[in-house]
Interface confidence: low
Amino acid sequence: YKAEVTVSQVYSGSLRVLNRHFSQDLGRRESIAFRSESAKAQKMLQELVASTRLGTYYNSSSVYSFGEGPLTCFFWFILDIPEYQRLTLSPEVVRELLVDELLSNSSTLASYKTEYEVDPEGLVILEASVNDIVVLNSTLGCYRYSYVNPGQVLPLKGPDQQTTSCLWHLQGPEDLMIKVRLEWTRVDCRDRVAMYDAAGPLEKRLITSVYGCSRQEPVMEVLASGSVMAVVWKKGMHSYYDPFLLSVKSVAFQDCQVNLTLEGRLDTQGFLRTPYYPSYYSPSTHCSWHLTVPSLDYGLALWFDAYALRRQKYNRLCTQGQWMIQNRRLCGFRTLQPYAERIPMVASDGVTINFTSQISLTGPGVQVYYSLYNQSDPCPGEFLCSVNGLCVPACDGIKDCPNGLDERNCVCRAMFQCQEDSTCISLPRVCDRQPDCLNGSDEEQCQEGVPCGTFTFQCEDRSCVKKPNPECDGQSDCRDGSDEQHCDCGLQGLSSRIVGGTVSSEGEWPWQASLQIRGRHICGGALIADRWVITAAHCFQEDSMASPKLWTVFLGKMRQNSRWPGEVSFKVSRLFLHPYHEEDSHDYDVALLQLDHPVVYSATVRPVCLPARSHFFEPGQHCWITGWGAQREGGPVSNTLQKVDVQLVPQDLCSEAYRYQVSPRMLCAGYRKGKKDACQGDSGGPLVCREPSGRWFLAGLVSWGLGCGRPNFFGVYTRVTRVINWIQQVLTHHHHHH
C-alpha cells in the first residue's frame, strides 16, 4: 500500500454577491460587521467548492476582504490535489467548475444559494502560493481597503507605527485602471514596497517591488492592468516616521495605436510613449505604432534612453517589454547606456512597431524618440556602431564601440591624415598657418566650413570648422563667431605660480571648489558657470550624502583650517547626478551642483573653460590636478590646496593596466613610475590642461584608481568631452531655476 502523494494548490480570487451591498464597516477588518460577514461568506465559499468535484480536495479557505459595488468578496482557498492531477486543475479549469455549479439548478439547493446570489460572470480565480498567503496574513493587522472614484486623487493613510507590514487594497470602476503614486520623503530607509496586479500580494502578479528609499526614482507612478491593485509595505528598521507618501487615482485606458508620417529631414521628429509616460507601463500594455517614411533613401532610427533592445529566443519571455519590429522579435532591457535601434527601409509602406508587456512585472514607462537617417551614409564623418546603433567618433584613440571596430583599420589614429600621401601629423599642427603636409593640405579650408568629423568643431549654426580646439583662442573661426562666445573662463587670477611646487598660491586655480559636509572637506569640484559646480557622482553614493541640503561649497579657498577674505561659500539648491552613473564600474562619474545664488567672479573665484565634444586633449600633454586630498595613500586630507602635474595617457595603455575596465567616458593621467597622482579627498576635483591661448580647459574629474601614485596604475578621470552634451543639457534646462 502506498499513500497517494498530494500537493497543496492555492487559489486566490474574488466573487460578486448581487443581493448584498458594501458598507464602510465591511472595509474595516476589526469591525463586528466584517467579522460576522466574512464568517458567513467563508462558509458560502466552502459550500460552493464542496458542491463540485473539488470538494474532496478542499483543505481550507478565507475571505479576507470586501469591496464596493454589489458586494465583492476577496478570498483564497487551498486544495490538496493528487500530484498527477496538479496540472489539470489550472485556475481556468477551477473557475469553470465553480461557474458550472453556480449556473446549475441542482435540486439539492445548496444552502449558500439561499443567502447569497453569486454572479457567475464576476468570478475571478488566480493562481497563488502558500507564501502569498503568508505575506497576506502578515498584513492583516494593517489592511486598508479603498474604493477610488473616477477623477479623485485619493491620498492613502500611512502605515500604523506599531505594525511591520501593511496592505492597501485598491479598487476602482471596472472600465478604468488603477494608478498609484509613491513618493519617497527621505533619501535613506530600508522599507520595502511591492505593488501587485491583483487584490492580494500574489507573487505571480507582482508589478514592481522597491527596496529602500529609491534615490533613482524619488517619485514613481505605477499602473495596474485594470481596476484592482494591492500595495504591500514592509517596515525597514528605524522608520520612526513614514518614509513615503502614497496616493491613488482611477484613470481611463489610453490608446497607443498611432499612424505617423515622417518628413524628409534628419533631426528628431517626435517620440513614441507608453500610456501615461513616465508612469510605469501597465501589465496590459499593447502599443502599435505605424511610421511611414517619405522615401527609401531613409532608414528609421529609434533613440532610447537607458533602455536597449536585443534578440531573445522565442521560447523565452521578455521580462522588460517585447518589441516586434518588421517581424523581428526583440526584448527590451534597462541599461545605463544610450541605445538606438536602426530600421533599414525595404518597403515604401513604412514600418509597424509593436510593444507588449508579456508579464505582470513592468518597469518605468518607455519613451522613444524617432528620426530618419540617410541609409547610404548613416553617420556622416563618424562610425556607425552596430552594437548599439550609435554614431561614434572614429580613429580618435578611444574605443567607443563595445566591439572596438571604430578604432580598427585606422591610417591615422588621433592624428590628421594628409591627403597627398596619407602621412599623419599631430592635430595641433592643423590650421596653424604652418604647412606640414607635402602639398600643405593641413592648411587648406581653414577659413571655410568643412564636412563635420571627429575632430572638427561644430559651430552654433551647425557648420563645422577644420581647425582643432578653436574655442576661446582669440580668433573667430566660425562664421557666426560662436567659437569665441562664453569665453569668460579659464584664466588664472593673481597667479604667482610656484613652478614644480606642490602648494598652490591664491588665485592660481580660481575654479577649484571644496565640497563640505558639516565643516568637513569631502570632495573637490570645479566652477563652470556662475551657478554651477561640477564634481564626481561617486561623492554622493552614500545614502547619507545624497541630499543637496547637506552640502556647502567653498570657492576661492586655500586652507581647510582657516578662512581668508578671498573665499566664498554657497549652499546647494539642486544636485544632478548623471543618469547613467554606475557605482561599480565608475562609468559616467559626473554630477552638477546648482548653487543657491550666483557667484560674483573675482581674481580668486572664476570658472574653468568647458571643452567642446570635439576638443582633443593629446596623450602625452602635461596637465594639472588640484585638491586637498591625501598626500599619501591612506593619509589624512591636506590643509593647503595642492597641485601636481600629470601626463595624459593613451587610452589603450591605461585600459591594459586596468584590465579593460576603462570606459570611453574615462581618461587616464599620471606616470608609469607612479608618484604623482590624485588621492582620497581629491575626488570630483579638476584635471585641467592649458591651451596655447593661455586658457585652461577642464579635461577630467578625479574619479578612481588603484591606490594613489602606485607604479603602473594611472589615475582615472571622468572624460569631460564624453559627458559634455549632458552637462550642456542640464545647464540649459535649469538655467533659470532658483
Epitope: 511591520t164 535613506d188 530600508r190 525597514g236 528598521m237 528605524h238 520612526y240 558639516r518
Partner: antibody, heavy 118, light 107 residues
Framework: QVQLQQPGAELAKPGASVKMSCKAS????????ITWVKQRPGQDLEWIGN????????YYNEKFKSKATLTVDTSSRTAYMQLSSLTSADSAVYYC???????????WGQGTSVTVSS | DIKMTQSPSSMYASLGERVTITCKAS??????LSWFQQKPGKSPKTLIY???RLVDGVPSRVSGSGSGQDYSLTISSLEYEDVGIYFC?????????FGAGTKLELK
C-alpha cells in the same frame, strides 16, 4: 575616535531598579541609534532594544519590554537604560553600542556588570 | 523572530589552519549580517558587516561570505590572537538576533 564609557559594575537588591549610563564621544550622537545588549555569564548575546537620540524613538525586544526603559540626554551625550523589578536572572553584563543600519554595531562599550543579590 | 543557527558550537584548530564558522538564518536576511569576536572578560569586537565587508583594522586573513540564509566566516590561516568566541548577528529585521556563538580554541 569613537568611545563609549560605561560604569564597570552595579550592585542591586532583588525587586529594586538600576539605571546604568553610556556616555558617547567621537561621533555625532544624535545621528546614530544606541543599542543595548545583554550577556549572562558564559551565555550568548541578547538584544534588548534601540533608542534614537535624535528623536527619542525606541524599539524593544518583546522579551524586555516590561523590564527595560531606554532614555537619552542629548546635552550630555549620554544614553541610559533602567532595569526594574530585578531578579537574579538580570545578573549579567550589559553593553551599549552605537548602531547603524548598514554597519550594525562597529564599536562597543566596555559593558556594565550588574549583580542582583540580597 | 529570525532564528540564527550557528555551527559548530566549539572547535579546536592548529596555528596556520583554515577555519570556517557558519550561521544559518531562518529566512532571507539580505546580507544584513555581522560577525563579532569576543575574548573572556572583554566586550565584543566587530570583524565583518554586511556579510562580507571587513571592518577597518581587521586583518585580511578574516573574510565573510554568503547570501540569503547561509553565511560563513573564514580565517585563512589561524593565528594565536584569533582564539575566542565568535558570534553572528542578523540585523535585517527587529528584533536583532545573535547566533549562540562558536568557541575557537587552539589544538
Amino acid at each position: 575616535q569613537v568611545q563609549l564609557q560605561q560604569p564597570g559594575a552595579e550592585l542591586a537588591k532583588p525587586g529594586a531598579s538600576v539605571k546604568m549610563s553610556c556616555k558617547a564621544s567621537g561621533y555625532t550622537f544624535t545621528s546614530y541609534w544606541i543599542t543595548w545588549v545583554k550577556q549572562r555569564p558564559g551565555q550568548d548575546l541578547e538584544w534588548i532594544g534601540n533608542i534614537y537620540p535624535g528623536s527619542g524613538s525606541t524599539y524593544y525586544n518583546e522579551k524586555f519590554k516590561s523590564k527595560a526603559t531606554l532614555t537619552v540626554d542629548t546635552s550630555s551625550r549620554t544614553a541610559y537604560m533602567q532595569l526594574s523589578s530585578l531578579t537574579s536572572a538580570d545578573s549579567a553584563v550589559y553593553y551599549c553600542a552605537p548602531y547603524d543600519s548598514d554597519y550594525a554595531m562597529d564599536y562597543w562599550g566596555q559593558g556594565t556588570s550588574v549583580t542582583v543579590s540580597s | 523572530d529570525i532564528k540564527m543557527t550557528q555551527s559548530p558550537s566549539s572547535m579546536y584548530a592548529s596555528l596556520g589552519e583554515r577555519v570556517t564558522i557558519t550561521c544559518k538564518a531562518s529566512q532571507d536576511i539580505n546580507n544584513y549580517l555581522s560577525w563579532f569576536q569576543q575574548k573572556p572578560g572583554k566586550s565584543p569586537k566587530t570583524l565583518i558587516y554586511r556579510a562580507n565587508r571587513l571592518v577597518d583594522g581587521v586583518p585580511s586573513r578574516v573574510s565573510g561570505s554568503g547570501s540569503g540564509q547561509d553565511y560563513s566566516l573564514t580565517i585563512s590561516s589561524l593565528e594565536y590572537e584569533d582564539v575566542g568566541i565568535y558570534f553572528c548577528l542578523q540585523y535585517d529585521e527587529f528584533p536583532l538576533t545573535f547566533g549562540a556563538g562558536t568557541k575557537l580554541e587552539l589544538k
